[in-house]
């Protein structure tokens, strides 16, 4: 079959090889498409509802006066010409639209080095096929999930038109010394080759360079988080700077409420105590620097017969700090 | 099998002080925190004190500033020195040690009254 591609809206003739160029001829156009259901006949009397959508030419082409997605699919003609020669004409007809240009929306005026930042959201609406969204940076292409790099794309379908909108959400960590003024821009490449990408206006957001603070350690012991039921795990927060600031504790993402202390000891471990820890270190000077995460977890205990056991009362279960 | 033996128990006015010990004899590699617990006639056994393998200690907020954990890692063995005692530490007092992948040991346990 010969691959044709159209525009969506515009017109399109596709020839019947072999056709008398008048009639009186004998052909018939077949057409699985997604207006049909299988093969729907064509033939050059037509008449119908048909007529609206495609038609029969007098030189036996077929005329598709607009266009759509439906039209999407498989184009066969079947001619004989005077000499009773049998023609056939066999098409694969794939529709586009090229979106308008796209744009960023939401671009930060400003990045943090270090940490990760959302530089803005790439739109592209009224795309078919769908395409593709790509950022690039200082011309160059970014590859999610390397160097910092990640990328949340979303598609969405016009429930009339049938026509996509692409969003991209770019979150970059700009790395420390790194450009203070970089490049970004996003650019659509549609789902049918041989139409060139369009790209968007740059945005060039400032990069922040935060003083460096030296890194909050927390230890876990035992090593890993991992504890048998009933076992004791102690989670101490590790700040170098001088004088040491306040320590407060997140669970999950939580806050504790406990007061603020470099150590917390979980005691006698139960299945509430597991999850995630970090403490959270705030500097009178500067803002609030949370540690890594560790994450708790009860493990089966090893096999080495009989404890002392666990002595009367149920046990603390719950986080025991001073 | 970890055989854990504590002694240093007793009657002591408020205001005395008190050294409870616990060694722990057998198979005890691997250890990376030992303890005190408490619990009084009715109550809850409640946490005192830890100290870790790497040394770090903290205690209940009702102790701190009395009671001091200490350990002797030659000799397996943890303690806790009681000063200033109050009626209201009298308890049974445990100790507990914590052994990477191995549910807790418990010690029998020591009684401490304090009168007033």
């Known amino acids: 079959a010969q691959n044709i591609t159209a525009r969506i809206g515009e017109p399109l003739v596709l020839k019947c090889k072999g056709a008398p160029k008048k009639p009186p001829q004998r052909l018939e156009w077949k057409l699985n498409t997604g207006r049909t259901e299988a093969w729907k006949v064509l033939s050059p009397q037509g008449g119908g509802p048909w007529d609206s959508v495609a038609r029969v030419l007098p030189n036996g082409s077929l005329f598709l006066p607009a266009v759509g997605i439906q039209d999407e699919g498989i184009f066969r003609c079947q001619a004989m010409n005077r000499n009773g020669k049998e023609t056939k004409s066999n098409y694969r007809v794939r529709v586009y639209q090229i979106p308008g240009k796209p744009e960023i929306v939401d671009s930060a005026s400003e990045l943090t080095a270090g940490v990760p930042n959302k530089v803005g959201t790439c739109v592209s609406e009224g795309s078919y096929p769908a395409g593709t969204l790509s950022w690039h940076l200082d011309g160059k292409p970014l590859v999610p999930n390397e160097k910092g790099v990640s990328v949340k794309e979303q598609t969405r379908r016009h429930p009339e038109t049938g026509l996509f909108t692409l969003q991209s959400e770019l979150m970059v960590t700009p790395a420390r010394g790194g450009d203070p003024r970089p490049t970004f821009s996003c650019s659509f490449s549609p789902g049918l080759p041989r139409h060139r990408a369009l790209r968007t206006a740059p945005i060039q957001p400032r990069v922040w360079e935060p003083v460096p603070l030296e890194e909050v350690q927390l230890v876990v012991e035992p090593e890993g988080g991992a504890v048998a039921p009933g076992g004791t795990v102690t989670l101490t927060c590790e700040v170098p700077a001088q004088p040491s600031p306040q320590i407060h504790w997140m669970k999950d993402g939580v806050p504790l409420p406990l007061p603020p202390s470099p150590v917390l000891i979980l005691p006698e471990i139960g299945p509430q105590d597991q999850g995630t820890y970090s403490c959270v270190a705030t500097h009178s000077s500067h803002g609030p620097q949370e540690s890594r995460a560790v994450s708790i977890s009860i493990i089966e205990p090893g096999e080495e017969g009989p404890t002392a056991g666990s002595v009367g009362g149920s046990g603390l279960g719950t986080l025991a700090l001073a | 099998q970890v055989q854990l033996v504590q002694s240093g128990g007793g009657l002591v006015q408020a205001g005395g002080s008190l050294r409870l010990s616990c060694a722990a004899s057998g198979s005890v590699s691997s250890i990376y925190a030992m303890g005190w617990y408490r619990q009084a006639p009715g109550k809850q056994r409640e946490w005192v004190t830890t100290?870790?393998?790497?040394?770090?200690?903290d205690y209940a907020a009702s102790v701190k500033g009395r009671f001091t954990i200490s350990r002797d890692t030659a000799k397996n063995a943890v303690y806790l020195q009681m000063n200033n005692l109050k009626p209201e530490d009298t308890a049974r007092y445990y100790c507990k040690i914590d052994r990477r992948g191995y549910a807790p040991y418990w010690g029998q346990g020591t009684q401490v009254t304090v009168s007033s």
């Open positions: 100290i870790t393998g790497r040394g770090i200690t």
